[in-house]
């Protein structure tokens, strides 16, 4: 049940964290004017990665999309990259994992199948998320950088008469949206990948027997699976329901075996 | 059409308060900003206040803050102007104005009312 | 607060020639984000309240004349009537529309020499 529950949660988390993703990279408010200098300005400017807007205080609002490709910034066009990199990573994960939920039956699915589509989604989703957190960070350091250049160039005198604010620009809101998203989504792939431990049935059908360093004593396994051979009925390591109690070892050396039916 | 009609001037002695009114019409009051600009007899104009369709944020220049209030009902299609601590300086003709969409410009204004500040 | 300098103060014309108002703020009224220039001009004659001529220093209200016209960017600015009218005797402001206080130039009496 708990690796269902984990499972279940990761990509709930997971769903959460993409859309989050999805919504940063759509969002105009990457970075926002500073207001520090000039509180009472009639005109807002913000930016985000495909356009830039601005906003006067009547409430109209024009933005202007970014239609060069070439002559945009090399920073702004590796953000870009990792944050479509991570939607579509995300997505492909979002995918496999409804695939993979243990509360979906496709067909005769084995668990080993659903525990490897679980593990991929997981990986997925963890490189979406790192892909998230990482341009959303760069965009960030970009941010700091063009801040403090310009606070250094805050007023250029034009002929010891004339001063020219430069506008700076703070953090957005995308970009804390794009931290928690891309976290959200890191969280969901280490649940997943954590779930996928409980799914995964053991490597060799061989378990009847444990061993113990310290005595002599044998714990013969109560059924389960069909020992000895390995030829029988259940070849390919099903679980047989076994109503019988456990040693304390077994419970201690195979802790997620028994979780399901 | 649109229309702004001011009332509420008058003589009053310094130190003391009034309150004008514009009255709205034409056009869909509360989607637009509002300000006051006023000119003094002979001189140049003065912008006074702003407030936005919303209410908030509002504006003012130096002179005047602390001393005057603008407010707006948008179901009364009024805007208002309160002045206290009135002084000499600030005997004007008052003007309503509305805030254009775009532009930051003031697109329609009002007839004016005289406020005479004197003792 | 940006303080805004128009000349001159009085400026005779005569009919059918063209008129330049100048401006200058003390600060740049172009706002980076989109290339736009805060600046307003209006014209009031006499006994009559301000009417809106241009905003965005060139982009002219609808209804005003194309004798009219608007330049200038970042801190000076000018107004051009290219060809003088009977009716364009007025006063004329140019208002900074980028920052609060918004603040009108001292005017400029346009007359017929």
């Known amino acids: 049940m708990a690796v269902t529950a984990c499972q279940g949660l990761g990509f709930v988390v997971s769903l959460i964290g993409i859309a989050g993703i999805i919504a940063a990279t759509c969002m105009d408010q990457w970075s926002t004017q500073d207001l520090y200098n000039n509180p009472v300005t009639a005109v807002f400017n913000y930016q985000g990665l495909w356009r830039s807007c601005v906003r006067e205080s009547s409430g109209f609002t024009e933005c202007r999309g970014y239609f060069t490709l070439l002559g945009l910034p090399a920073m702004l066009q590796a953000v870009r990259a990792l944050m479509i990199v991570g939607i579509v990573l995300g997505a492909i994960g979002l995918l496999v994992s409804i695939f993979a939920l243990k509360c979906i039956r496709i067909g005769s699915m084995e668990d080993s199948a659903k525990a490897n589509m679980t593990l991929t989604s997981g990986i997925m989703f963890i490189v979406s998320g790192l892909c998230a957190i990482a341009g959303v960070s760069v965009f960030a350091n970009m941010l700091v950088t063009n801040f403090w250049m310009s606070t250094a160039n805050m007023y250029t005198g034009m002929g010891g008469m004339v001063q020219t604010v430069q506008t700076r620009y703070t953090f957005g809101a995308a970009l804390f949206v794009g931290w928690v998203a891309g976290g959200l989504t890191l969280i969901g792939g280490v649940m997943m990948c954590i779930a996928c431990r409980g799914l995964a049935p053991e490597e060799t059908n061989y378990k009847a027997v444990s061993y113990h360093a310290s005595g002599h004593s044998v714990a013969y396994k109560p059924g389960g699976f069909k020992a000895s051979t390995g030829f029988g009925s259940n070849t390919k390591n099903k679980k047989i329901y076994d109503g019988g109690a456990r040693t304390e070892d077994e419970v201690q050396s195979y802790p997620s075996k028994h979780d399901y039916v | 059409e649109v229309q702004l009609v001011e009332s509420g001037g008058g003589l009053v002695q310094p130190g003391g308060s009034l309150r004008l009114s514009c009255a709205a019409s034409?056009?869909?009051?509360?989607?637009?900003?509002m300000h006051w600009v006023r000119q003094a007899p002979g001189k140049g104009l003065e912008w006074v206040s702003y407030i936005t369709s919303g209410e908030s944020p509002i504006y003012f220049t130096d002179t005047v803050k602390g001393r005057f209030t603008i407010s707006r009902d948008n179901a009364k299609n009024s805007l208002y102007l309160q002045m206290n601590s009135l002084r000499a300086e600030d005997t004007a003709v008052y003007y309503c104005a509305r805030s254009s969409y775009y532009g930051q410009s003031m697109d329609y204004w009002g007839q004016g009312t005289l406020v005479t500040v004197s003792s | 607060d940006i303080v805004m300098t128009q000349s001159p103060d009085s400026l005779a014309v005569s009919l059918g020639e063209r008129a330049t108002i100048n401006c200058r703020s003390s600060q740049s009224l172009l706002n980076a984000g989109n290339r736009k220039n805060y600046l307003t001009w209006y014209q009031q004659k006499p006994g009559q309240p301000p009417k809106l001529l241009i905003y965005?220093?060139?982009t002219r209200e609808s209804g005003v004349p194309d004798r009219f016209s608007g330049s200038g960017s970042g801190t000076d600015f000018t107004l051009t009537i290219s060809s003088l009218q009977a009716e364009d005797v007025a006063v004329y402001y140019c208002?900074?529309?980028?920052?609060?206080?918004?603040?009108f130039g001292g005017g400029t009496k346009l007359e017929i020499k």
């Open positions: 965005w220093a060139s």
């Open positions: 034409g056009f869909t009051f509360s989607t637009f900003g």
């Open positions: 208002q900074n529309a980028y920052s609060y206080p918004f603040t």
